[in-house]
């Protein structure tokens, strides 16, 4: 409703690429949801730029994002989670670029945690377990998990296993003996909600036993 930029500023702004991406996190803080957006070009001058979301909200027509360094976010209970919202990059009242987005299709789960590996000597296997906050959530409850592990010396040779539970058994014979392994896990929505992989959990490190010379099995 008032002037924010000189015409020259706006003309310069229109030459820039204001492509952006967003992800939502539902019930990330109690019953609060969050929406995070960022420019795809890290060199965009964000000084006078704001993000605004309109539509598919409760109580208010539009909400302004909060800016923290180079990311923009909202934390609120007021997402309707039905229908599409319009997310715009704005200079004052002028919209530079907008996207219509259903927040249920850009969900990024929280990272799994408490990853651990226990060796079962009698069964000759390793039981991998981890936890996820999504088991307690009302909305994004069903996830697909991606467990990735590698021998520590193999920089980029990750083995991936997809599963819907939070427990995985790795057979001892599939792993190298007397080796140090790194393992980590991430999650993605798998039912109704769509979106992106979570961040990886912190890595867990475990060592496989040596081969028992007499039987050819690991100790």
């Amino acid at each position: 409703e008032s002037g924010y930029a000189q015409n020259g500023d706006l003309e310069d702004a229109e030459l820039d690429d204001y492509s952006f991406s967003c992800y939502s996190q539902l019930e990330v803080n109690g019953s609060q949801h969050s929406l995070t957006c960022a420019f795809e070009d890290p060199d965009v001058n964000t000084t006078n730029l704001e993000f605004e979301i309109c539509g598919a909200l409760v109580e208010v027509k539009c909400l302004n994002f909060r800016k923290l360094q180079e990311i923009y976010f909202i934390e609120t209970k007021k997402f309707l989670l039905i229908g599409k919202s319009n997310i715009c990059v704005k200079v004052g009242e002028k919209s530079l670029t907008c996207k219509k987005i259903d927040l249920t299709t850009i969900v990024k789960p929280e990272a799994p945690f408490d990853l651990s590996v226990i060796y079962r000597e009698g069964a000759n296997d390793f039981v991998v377990t981890f936890n996820t906050s999504h088991l307690q959530k009302k909305y994004v409850k069903v996830l697909m998990h991606d467990v990735a592990y590698r021998q520590e010396k193999d920089e980029n040779k990750w083995t991936h296993v997809n599963l819907s539970s939070t427990k995985l058994t790795l057979l001892q014979r599939k792993l190298q003996p007397a080796a140090m392994y790194e393992i980590k896990v991430r999650s993605i929505p798998d039912h109704y909600f769509k979106g992106f992989w979570s961040e990886w959990s912190p890595s867990y490190y475990f060592r496989t036993p040596e081969i028992n010379n007499s039987s050819g099995e690991m100790d």
């Epitope: 409703e1 924010y4 704001e50 109580e59 302004n64 909060r66």
Partner: antibody, heavy 122, light 107 residues
Framework: QVQLVESGGGLVKPGGSLRLSCAVS????????MAWIRQAPGKGLEWVST????????YYPDSVKGRFTISRDNAKNSLYLQMNSLRAEDTAVYYC???????????????WGQGTLVTVSS | DIQMTQSPSSLSASVGDRVTITCRTS??????LAWYQQKPGKAPKLLLY???TLHIGVPSRFSGSGSGTDYTLTISSLQPEDFATYYC?????????FGGGTKVEIK
Amino acid sequence: QVQLVESGGGLVKPGGSLRLSCAVSGFTLSDYYMAWIRQAPGKGLEWVSTISASGLRTYYPDSVKGRFTISRDNAKNSLYLQMNSLRAEDTAVYYCARPLSAHYGFNYFDYWGQGTLVTVSS
Amino acid sequence: DIQMTQSPSSLSASVGDRVTITCRTSEDIYQGLAWYQQKPGKAPKLLLYSANTLHIGVPSRFSGSGSGTDYTLTISSLQPEDFATYYCQQYYDYPLAFGGGTKVEIK
């Protein structure tokens, strides 16, 4: 504790100008949208202006648009209302008000100043 | 712009009475409604927001309800300190708007 203290009111002739200030304390001004709301003598409440937390967006009703300008100086913990081309119908107590919720733009107000009286009369 | 119609403009009631004030908006405000109490010479005080959420420190005899375009403030048992003027306010969209007020007087 949260405090909002308005100043700058007084008697002014029609067509004149006045600048109201609101000194705030007890919270981080830069986290909040802020607003001015007025009340003519014996009348109801009327919203006058809102400024976003960043100060980049300002909002006005048609009754004051083009005549009033809201601004803020977060470093000085101050909110301002510059009023130009004043009319008799602008006579009112002017309150500055802070929303309950920080950021985003939920405009319901839990903290109000004591008000400053602006009288526009020849 | 969203128009606000608050009724009644005034009412007389006795201590202990149940009092109901209504606010109607010209379009759906999706529960973006607040209620305030104001006493003479004082700034307004926030009572409720989100149409039905009681602000911290407000007595539980105050309650709010409604959705769409029709909203209600109820005082279940009027107390001496409740004689005041009450305003509704929509914050769904700009321009923000207040109802005309309801003056609650002693019968």
